[in-house]
């Protein structure tokens, strides 16, 4: 008799999820000498333990504690780059500017980036058919709780000047419901963080508007200022040139506005 299985609204666990997590862990620890001590099998066991046999709408931050402990990693607190709805450019930037870090440049972020996972209550099976959608099903699902947990911790780690890359092509350049807007902004520590500097990335080549005057950016400025953190904003009119100038700052064309 086929066993009844809960149908969720979101896509199922990424295929070959266990192998992917383990392989990513091995690769990361090989590339980053300071993380060579990490036992990747233990990391996978802790990751699995956070969601296997648990109802996928009933996951808590405590479920991820063993994984978080194994994934402890010191990041330079004044070199943190947050992002919202513009992940690819943020990652391209930190690949060039090697001393800056996005969450996905840390072990835990690297392990889970672009993956989906969930289990089923009372069985040791991974659900490859469907997983809960944050809006349609429940917010306390394995993926959402993971990112909320690591994002909170990443924001808490920040100090001095924190940068955030925002997508100027979106209707809400700053979105209060994004991970940045709902978690990271509220977990920056005013006693440690002096300034949040937003980089608004323009999409159109002929777009010369000052997107730092956008109402949602003003909303972000208001939230940040109320938390006793200074706010500054820069337009990045030409993201392609911006990256090029990060690679080659001596280039003569890099003295003009980008």
């Amino acid at each position: 008799v086929p066993r009844w299985r809960q149908q969720w609204s979101g896509p199922g666990t990424t295929k070959r999820f266990p192998e992917t997590v383990l392989a990513r862990c091995v690769k990361y620890t090989e590339i980053h000498p300071e993380m060579r001590h990490v036992d990747c099998q233990s990391v996978w066991d802790a990751f699995k333990g956070a969601f296997i046999s648990k109802h996928p709408c009933n996951i808590t931050e405590e479920d991820y504690q063993p994984l978080m402990k194994l994934g402890t990693q010191t990041v330079p607190c004044n070199k943190i780059l947050l992002w919202s709805r513009i992940k690819d450019l943020a990652h391209q930037f930190t690949q060039v500017q090697r001393d800056m870090f996005t969450l996905e440049d840390t072990l835990l972020g690297y392990l889970a980036d672009d993956l989906t996972w969930c289990g089923e209550f009372n069985t040791s099976k991974i659900n490859y058919q469907s997983c809960p959608d944050w809006r349609k099903d429940c917010s306390n699902n394995p993926v959402s709780v993971f990112w909320k947990t690591v994002s909170r911790r990443f924001a808490e780690a920040a100090c001095d000047v924190v940068h955030v890359m925002l997508n100027g092509s979106r209707s809400k350049i700053f979105d209060k419901n994004s991970t940045f807007g709902s978690v990271e902004v509220h977990n920056l520590q005013p006693e440690k963080v002096q300034t949040l500097e937003a980089w608004v990335i323009h999409g159109g080549r002929e777009d010369s508007r000052d997107l730092c005057q956008d109402p949602t950016i003003k909303e972000l400025e208001s939230i940040i200022s109320k938390r006793n953190i200074q706010f500054s904003c820069k337009n990045i009119y030409r993201p392609d040139k911006f990256l090029q100038c990060v690679k080659n700052p001596e280039d003569s064309s890099c003295t003009s506005e980008i």
Partner: nanobody
């Protein structure tokens, strides 16, 4: 509940070495769950991170103070200490010891727990 308490002289002469101790209660200083550090706040200025010591025994210091700072741990007394050499009037500040959870991505500046602070004045 973890508690931290700073102790040491409130007055230090210029060019001498400032020595402070932090006593930890409610948890073991040698636990892999925590890392420890020192921060300070000069009068009218922002908090400044001085340095930290990790479970592995490795240390991390603020580059601007690195040549003058030493942080060490005494597990038998459940304490960690700060030594800051060649002090000047600019080192006058409230000094805090702090603790942080070893939990996911962490900054060098521990901010999960903090002592109440002790004022150190550098003056002859």
């Amino acid at each position: 509940q973890l508690q931290l308490q700073e102790s040491g002289p409130g007055l230090v002469k210029p060019s001498e070495t400032l020595s402070l101790t932090c006593t930890v209660s409610g948890g073991s200083i040698s636990s892999s769950s925590y890392y420890w550090g020192w921060i300070r706040q000069p009068p009218g200025k922002r908090l400044e991170w001085i340095g930290s010591i990790y479970y592995s025994g490795s240390t991390d210091y603020n580059p601007s103070l690195k040549s003058r700072v030493t942080i060490s741990v005494d597990t038998s007394k459940n304490q960690f200490s700060l030594k800051l050499s060649s002090v000047t009037a600019a080192d006058t500040a409230v000094y805090y010891c702090a603790g942080g959870y070893n939990y996911g991505p962490v900054g060098q500046w521990p901010s999960d727990y903090r002592g109440q602070g002790t004022l150190v004045t550098v003056s002859s």
